[in-house]
Interface confidence: medium
C-alpha cells in the first residue's frame, strides 16, 4: 500500500502536488509498511479493542486562517477514556481514586510501555531496531527521552505526509508560502505502540484556510455604552476602535502596518500606523464603517523574465500578487540604506485586510454628577441609620432607571444594591434617597441608565457615629474634596 491509500480519499491533482510542496514533508506516493502499521477501514471491529477501556478521541485544531507565506500550526490532543492519563514516563495510568464503569483498578497501568521497551529485543547498540521506525521505514529520531514517546502521528495534506513521534499532545507547523489559497484538508492518523508493532487508535480531520487577505477583527468600546456587542453606540462620546490582526506566527512582525479608516460620516479618510483609533460621531443615524489594513509582507519574488520565444504561461501564485519588488542592493552607492531595510527577506508584497461594520448612533446618557448630598432628618426609632439624599444631574438623554451600589471603602465588597425606575424632567435633575446602616466610610456607585446607555459616578462618603441624645437633626450639606476623580464627602455632625 501507499500512503495515499491509507491516509485519505482526496487526491490532489499533479499540478496541486507540484505547486504545494511543503518543506520537510514527503510524497504520499511512498510505500506504507502495513506489517508494522496495520490499516483498518472505518467500521472494522478491531477498532473496538484498539484501546483498553474505551476509545481514544483525537482533537485536531489549527490557528487557521493563515496569511499565505506565514506558518500555520496544527495541534493534536488525545483524550483518553475516563480515569486514564499519561504519566511523566509516557505510560498510561489510571487516575487515583477515580471510578469508571469497571470500578477502581488494582493495576495502576493501562499501558506500561517502559516495561515493554526494557524487555524489547533485536536492538543494535544504538537502541535502534527494525520496529522503531515510522510507516515509511524512516527511523525514529533519538531525542533525549524518546522512549517515553509512545504515539506515532501521521499528518496528511496536499498529497504529502509528515510523521511525528510524540506523547499525548503534539504540534506541527507548516509554512504556507507554497500552499494554494482557499480551504484545505488536514488529516491525522494516530498509532500507539503495541509490542514490536503499532495499533491505530484514532483518526481526525480538520479544514484549514490559507488566504491572501490579512485576517482582521475590530473590537469597539465606548464609555457608557450599555451593550458593546450590538454595534449601537452613543452620540458625542468617543468610540475606541482596536484592530486585532490574526497573525499567530508573527509573520507581519517586520511589516509596517497602515490602517485606513472611513467612518461613514463624511469626516473623510483617516490613516494611522496605530492599531487603536478614537472617533466621535456627532449625529444620530446609521453609518458604514470601513477599514483597510495594509502591510508590506515578505512575499515571493517575481519570476525571472520569460524567454523571448512565445510560450504558454504557467499559472502560479505570482499571478495573484498585487505588487512585488526585489530588495537586492544595487551597486555600491546606489542606495545607501538598502541593506538595512527589510531583514532576512529579499522581496516584499502589499497585503490587505478589510473590515466593514454598520454602526448605529443614538442619544445616550453622556455624564452623571452628584452635585449635592444632604443628611435627612431621621425619627428616633432608627438611631443606627442615616438617610442621605443625593442630588444628581446628567447630560445627554433622559435616564429611566437609577441604581446605587453601596460597598466598602475599597469599592470592592458590595453591601447593598438598589435599583428603581425614575421619572426625570428635561433638566435631568433628580434626588436619590438611600439609607446607610451604621457609621463608617462607604463607597457609593451611582448609575443612571436607559435602553442604550449606562453612566456611572462614584463617591466615598463618611457617616459619623449617631448621638443618641439628639432625636432630631437638621439637614446638613456635605463638604466636597476632589480626590483623583472620586469625591470624598465628609459628613459633619453638629
Amino acid at each position: 500500500k501507499r500512503f495515499h491509500d491509507v491516509l485519505g480519499n482526496e487526491r490532489p491533482s499533479a499540478y496541486m502536488r507540484e505547486h504545494n510542496q511543503l518543506n520537510g514533508w514527503s510524497s504520499d506516493e511512498n510505500d506504507w509498511n502495513e506489517k508494522l502499521y496495520p490499516v483498518w477501514k472505518r467500521g472494522d471491529m478491531r477498532w473496538k479493542n484498539s484501546w483498553k477501556g474505551g476509545r481514544v478521541q483525537a482533537v485536531l485544531t489549527s490557528d487557521s486562517p493563515a496569511l499565505v507565506g506565514s506558518n500555520i500550526t496544527f495541534a493534536v490532543n488525545l483524550i483518553f477514556p475516563r480515569c486514564q492519563k499519561e504519566d511523566a514516563n509516557g505510560n498510561i495510568v489510571y487516575e487515583k481514586n477515580c471510578r469508571n464503569e469497571a470500578g477502581l483498578s488494582a493495576d495502576p497501568y493501562v499501558y506500561n510501555w517502559t516495561a515493554w521497551s526494557e524487555d524489547s529485543d533485536g536492538e543494535n547498540g544504538t537502541g535502534q531496531s527494525h520496529h522503531n521506525v515510522f510507516p515509511d521505514g524512516k527511523p525514529f529520531p533519538h531525542h533525549p527521552g524518546w522512549r517515553r514517546w509512545n504515539f506515532i502521528y501521521v499528518f496528511h495534506t496536499l498529497g504529502q505526509y509528515f510523521q511525528k513521534l510524540g506523547r499525548c499532545s503534539v504540534r506541527v507547523s507548516v509554512n504556507t508560502a507554497n500552499v494554494t489559497l482557499g480551504p484545505q484538508l488536514m488529516e491525522v492518523t494516530v498509532y500507539r505502540r503495541h509490542g514490536r508493532a503499532y495499533v491505530p487508535i484514532a483518526q481526525v480531520k480538520d479544514v484549514y484556510v490559507v488566504t491572501d487577505q490579512i485576517p482582521v477583527f475590530v473590537t469597539m468600546f465606548q464609555k457608557n455604552d450599555r451593550n458593546s456587542s450590538d454595534e449601537t453606540f452613543l452620540k458625542d462620546l468617543p468610540i475606541m476602535f482596536d484592530v486585532l490582526i490574526h497573525d499567530p506566527s508573527h509573520f507581519l512582525n517586520y511589516s509596517t502596518i497602515n490602517y485606513k479608516w472611513s467612518f461613514g460620516d463624511n469626516t473623510g479618510l483617516f490613516v494611522s500606523t496605530n492599531h487603536t483609533v478614537n472617533h466621535t460621531y456627532v449625529l444620530n443615524g446609521t453609518f458604514s464603517l470601513n477599514l483597510t489594513v495594509k502591510a508590506a509582507a515578505p512575499g515571493p519574488c517575481p519570476p525571472p523574465p520569460p524567454p523571448p520565444r512565445p510560450s504558454k504561461p504557467t499559472p502560479s501564485l505570482a499571478t495573484t500578487l498585487k505588487s512585488y519588488d526585489s530588495n537586492t542592493p544595487g551597486p555600491a552607492g546606489d542606495n545607501p540604506l538598502e541593506l538595512s531595510r527589510i531583514p532576512d527577506e529579499n522581496c516584499q508584497i502589499n497585503r490587505y485586510g478589510h473590515f466593514q461594520a454598520t454602526i448605529t448612533i443614538v442619544e445616550g446618557i453622556l455624564e452623571v454628577n452628584i452635585i449635592q448630598m444632604t443628611d435627612v432628618l431621621m425619627p428616633v426609632p432608627w438611631p443606627e441609620s442615616s438617610l442621605i439624599d443625593f442630588v444628581v444631574t446628567c447630560q445627554g438623554s433622559i435616564p429611566t432607571e437609577v441604581c446605587t451600589i453601596i460597598s466598602d471603602p475599597t469599592c470592592e465588597i458590595t453591601q447593598n444594591t438598589v435599583c428603581s425606575p425614575v421619572d426625570v424632567d428635561e433638566m435631568c435633575l433628580l434626588t436619590v434617597r438611600r439609607t446607610f446602616n451604621g457609621s463608617g466610610t462607604y463607597c457609593v456607585n451611582l448609575t443612571l441608565g436607559d435602553d442604550t446607555s449606562l453612566a456611572l459616578t462614584s463617591t466615598l462618603i463618611s457617616v459619623p457615629d449617631r448621638d443618641p441624645a439628639s432625636p432630631l437633626r437638621m439637614a446638613n450639606e456635605f463638604d466636597y474634596k476632589d480626590d483623583d476623580d472620586k469625591l470624598e464627602h465628609h459628613h459633619h455632625h453638629h
Partner: antibody, heavy 122, light 106 residues
Framework: QVQLVQSGAEVKKPGASVKVSCKAS????????MGWVKQRPGQGLEWIGA????????NYNQNFKGRVTMTVDTSISTAYMELSRLRSDDSAVYFC???????????????WGQGTLVTVSS | EIVLTQSPSSLSASVGDRVTITCSAS?????MHWYQQKSGTAPKLLIY???NLASGVPSRFSGSGSGTDFTFTISSLQPEDAATYYC?????????FGGGTKLEIK
Amino acid sequence: QVQLVQSGAEVKKPGASVKVSCKASGYTFTANWMGWVKQRPGQGLEWIGAIDPSDSFTNYNQNFKGRVTMTVDTSISTAYMELSRLRSDDSAVYFCTRSGYYGSPKLGGDYWGQGTLVTVSS
Amino acid sequence: EIVLTQSPSSLSASVGDRVTITCSASSSISYMHWYQQKSGTAPKLLIYSTSNLASGVPSRFSGSGSGTDFTFTISSLQPEDAATYYCHQWNSYPCTFGGGTKLEIK
C-alpha cells in the same frame, strides 16, 4: 544612482491649482513611499502627505485635506502632487522625498528632489 | 499629532566645539531622524532610526535617545556644518518635523 527631479517654478493666482511632478530614477519606484514636504520662505518643514506608488495608497496631513491630491504614473516612475484652491500662504518651496521602504517608519527621507518654488500672487 | 520641540532654536559655536541639539516629542516614539539643510538646498538625511549614520555622512555626527527625548551631536564642529538642523518622526501620522536649530560658526 538615485535621483528625484522636480518640475520647474510656478506662479499661480489665488484660487487656482498647481501640479508639481517628481521623476524618480535609480531605484525600484514602487518599493518606496514618496513623501511631499512644504517649506515657506525662512520657515521650517511641514509634511503634506505621502503616497505608496505600488498601489496609490495615500496619506494626507489633515491640514491639507481636501486640497491635496497625490498620484503616480508608475510607467514613467513619476509622482505628482496637486494643490488646489491656492492661497497666499501656499507660497513655498515644495519638496518630494523618497520615504521609508514599504512605509517603514525606521527610515527618513533618504533622497530629496531639488524643490519646486510655487508663488501664489494676484 | 506628535509635536517635536527642538532646542535651542539657534546657536553659535566655534570650530572644534562639541555641539548638542535636543528634540523632545510630545508622545513616545520609536525612531527619530535628523536632517541638515543649507540655504537654498533640499534637506539632507544625516541620521536615521535615531542613531544610524546615513551613507557618506561624516562620523562626527551622531544621534541617540529613546521614548520622548532625543539628542543630535556634532563631536567636533567644522566650518561646513553651518546650517539648519531638523528632527523628524514618521512613527505616527502625520509625520512631523521639529522647528529647526540654526547653527552658526563663530
